[in-house]
């Protein structure tokens, strides 16, 4: 029983900083209770960007002062990723978990390379 | 950097109970899924339990089910694990380690802490 | 609860020389969610590998892992001094979570 996560391979951000993209998942077992995590891997260094747990069902909420904001319908879920810079560019990994009831399964996908151009300034006008 | 120190191991009487604590440092405690690991005596490694992030979640091995419980305070970065109703076959050195990241393989280990069950 | 098999049980071999660990789980280990540890006497055990070839910090890289599903393997390239001890494979793709019994490589 493997838990499978598909995302897209490449994702281009807005000019306004702005990243959105799909987490799907193939759940092994009937989980009410799902955990998604993003993750950016930056020279074989990971970090955790954002977190957030729902109930299935129920709307994903992550903390107030995330960067991230997400919907969910079924298996699938829809993640913004907001503030980007250009310094911010590289690999976001969604790690699906299935936290209740046990037992728990793991899922994580192949990542999404996020490009992010910071906008040239607007020239001085007279 | 990342420092998990165990303590409350002993000798213990079989059917009494212990409880094991584990102060954690170096790192956002809540952020990451927490076990506790066993190894008896001359003997190779055991998952116990696992509690995730904010501690609502919890898992064990069949071994332990319904004697131990595992639980962690955020606020404090501690993690706990009740032992009761102990067995001799529950002797063994105690590994609070921490989950990785990438899923719950073990990237930090503490030192141990021996519990002894025996008359 | 996913079963794993480790062999052989003990390996000799002499410094320089390269060690290779086999790792049978008796179901498909999902994505490769398989870990490899090391553990000397009287120390807690230290994480090699993770995700069946991703080397964990401060690796050397004469330590590489390999395979997926049910077969998996840990290769040193050549063994030093220090790297005789026992090692752990461990599966966490599911609940339980579930070592190997492990395999002692010792000096030959």
């Known amino acids: 029983k493997a838990m499978h996560v598909a995302q897209p391979a490449v994702v281009l951000a807005s000019s306004r900083g702005i990243a959105s993209f799909v987490c799907e998942y193939a759940s092994p077992g009937k989980a009410t209770e799902v955990r998604v995590t993003v993750l950016r891997q930056a020279d074989s260094q990971v970090t955790e960007v954002c977190a957030a747990t729902y109930m299935m069902g129920n709307e994903l909420t992550f903390l107030d002062d995330s960067i991230c904001t997400g919907t969910s319908s079924g298996n699938q879920v829809n993640l913004t990723i907001q503030g980007l810079r250009a310094m911010d560019t590289g690999l976001y990994i969604c790690k699906v978990e299935l936290m209740y009831p046990p037992p728990y399964y793991l899922g994580i996908g192949n990542g999404t390379q996020i490009y992010v151009i910071d906008p040239e300034p607007c020239p001085d006008s007279d | 950097q990342v420092q998990l120190v165990e303590s409350g191991g002993g000798v213990v009487q079989p059917g009494r109970s212990l409880r094991l604590s584990c102060a954690a440092s170096?790192?956002?405690?809540?952020?990451?899924?927490m076990h506790w690991v066993r190894q008896a005596p001359g003997k190779g490694l055991e998952w116990v339990a696992v509690?995730?992030?904010?501690?609502?979640?919890?898992d064990y091995a069949d071994s332990v089910k319904g004697r131990i419980t595992i639980s962690r305070d955020n606020s404090k970065n501690t993690l706990y694990l009740q032992m009761n109703s102990l067995r001799a076959e529950d002797t063994a050195v105690y590994y609070c380690?921490?989950?990785?990241?990438?899923?719950?393989?073990?990237?930090?280990w503490g030192q141990g802490t021996l519990v002894t069950v025996s008359s | 609860e996913i079963v794993l098999t480790q062999s052989p049980g003990t390996l000799s071999l002499s410094p320089g020389e390269r060690a290779t660990l086999s790792c049978r789980a008796s179901?498909?280990?999902?994505?490769?969610?398989l870990a490899w540890y090391q553990q000397k006497p009287g120390q807690a055990p230290r994480l090699l590998i993770y995700?069946?070839?991703s080397r964990a910090t401060g690796i050397p890289d004469r330590f590489s892992g390999s395979g997926s599903g049910t077969d998996f393997t840990l290769t040193i390239s050549r063994l030093e001094p220090e790297d005789f001890a026992v090692y752990y494979c461990?599966?966490?793709?599911?609940?339980?979570?579930?070592f190997g019994p492990g395999t002692k490589v010792d000096i030959k």
């Open positions: 380690a921490r989950g990785g990241l990438l899923g719950p393989y073990f990237d930090y």
């Open positions: 509690i995730w992030y904010d501690g609502r979640n919890k």
């Open positions: 179901q498909s280990v999902s994505s490769s969610y």
């Open positions: 461990q599966q966490y793709g599911s609940s339980p979570f579930t």
């Open positions: 995700g069946a070839s």
């Open positions: 170096g790192f956002t405690f809540s952020s990451y899924g």
